[in-house]
């Protein structure tokens, strides 16, 4: 015998109190598949969460985070605060990047400045907390009468401090 509830489409539920008639989901609830015996309560996007997509009878609401926060977790289950450029988020809040490191985004960690000398280049623009250094031509290229042939880059050695 076929289950009469299997005929109930998404957006309805099989109402046992009414001889298994397919009843529409009540307000603020949904069923995303057919044959459901109950409808699920819609997610509410409150506080630091804001509504990205309204709940409908066939699909749950979707949340994202208010400005100043970004989503974490499946389906944006959590909101993590943004930091300013030049900072990183630590367990105790936003902290400025240490000297020699930078972060050009509102999330993530501070990264060391590029070490230009590892590629045989000079520093063209100094780094800041918000920006990496800009490497220029190699010192040899800047000397008068220098050959246009770029010398091979030295082998990378571990442990060089950023410059």
């Amino acid at each position: 015998l076929q289950d009469p509830c299997s005929n109930c489409p998404a957006g309805t539920f099989c109402d046992n109190n009414r001889n298994q008639i397919c009843s529409p989901c009540p307000p603020n609830s949904f069923s995303s598949a057919g044959g459901q015996r109950t409808c699920d309560i819609c997610r509410q996007c409150k506080g630091v969460f804001r509504t990205r997509k309204e709940c409908s009878s066939t699909s749950n609401a979707e949340c994202d985070c208010t400005p100043g926060f970004h989503c974490l977790g499946a389906g944006c289950s959590m909101c993590e605060q943004d930091c300013k450029q030049g900072q990183e988020l630590t367990k105790k809040g936003c902290k400025d990047c240490c000297f020699g490191t930078f972060n050009d985004q509102k999330r993530g960690i501070c990264r060391p400045w590029t070490n230009c000398s590892l590629d045989g280049k000079s520093v063209l623009v100094n780094g800041t907390k918000e920006r990496d250094v800009v490497c220029g031509p190699s010192p040899a290229d800047l000397s008068p009468g220098a050959s246009s042939v770029t010398p091979p880059a030295p082998a990378r050695e571990p442990g060089h401090s950023p410059q």
Partner: nanobody
């Protein structure tokens, strides 16, 4: 598949206690530091406490120091958070999280897996 499942949340009166548990599966539990993080209504994530893989190093947010105790039982693949002297401001969804290495600190977030969370409500 790595999974973290929190339990133990509920409604408690101010000054009361609760113990949260986090059952871990899908990875070698003792090799990784673990962290509790919470999200109060209308607020962003707040780090609560972290413990190293071996359990010998623990760290706490100033807001919970002296009231909360983090611990782990590596033989049961379970993380705990004992919460005493609870206050209204401790009301939040509490998430258990796996860090990426065995060591931890009170500085970097190094979280790569989150649980689904358990709700703690402190109210009279």
């Amino acid at each position: 598949e790595v999974q973290l499942l929190e339990s133990g949340g509920g409604l408690v009166q101010p000054g009361g206690s609760l113990r949260l548990s986090c059952a871990a599966s899908g990875f070698t539990f003792s090799n990784y530091a673990m962290t509790w993080v919470r999200q109060a209504p209308g607020k962003g994530l707040e780090w609560v406490s972290s413990i190293s893989g071996s359990g010998d190093s623990t760290y706490y947010a100033d807001s919970v120091k002296g009231r909360f105790t983090i611990s782990r039982d590596n033989s049961k693949n379970t993380l705990y958070l004992q919460m005493n002297s609870l206050r209204a401001e401790d009301t939040a969804v509490y998430y258990c999280a796996k860090e990426g290495t065995g060591t931890t600190s009170d500085y970097y977030y190094n979280v790569d897996v989150w649980g689904q969370g358990t709700t703690v409500t402190v109210s009279s």
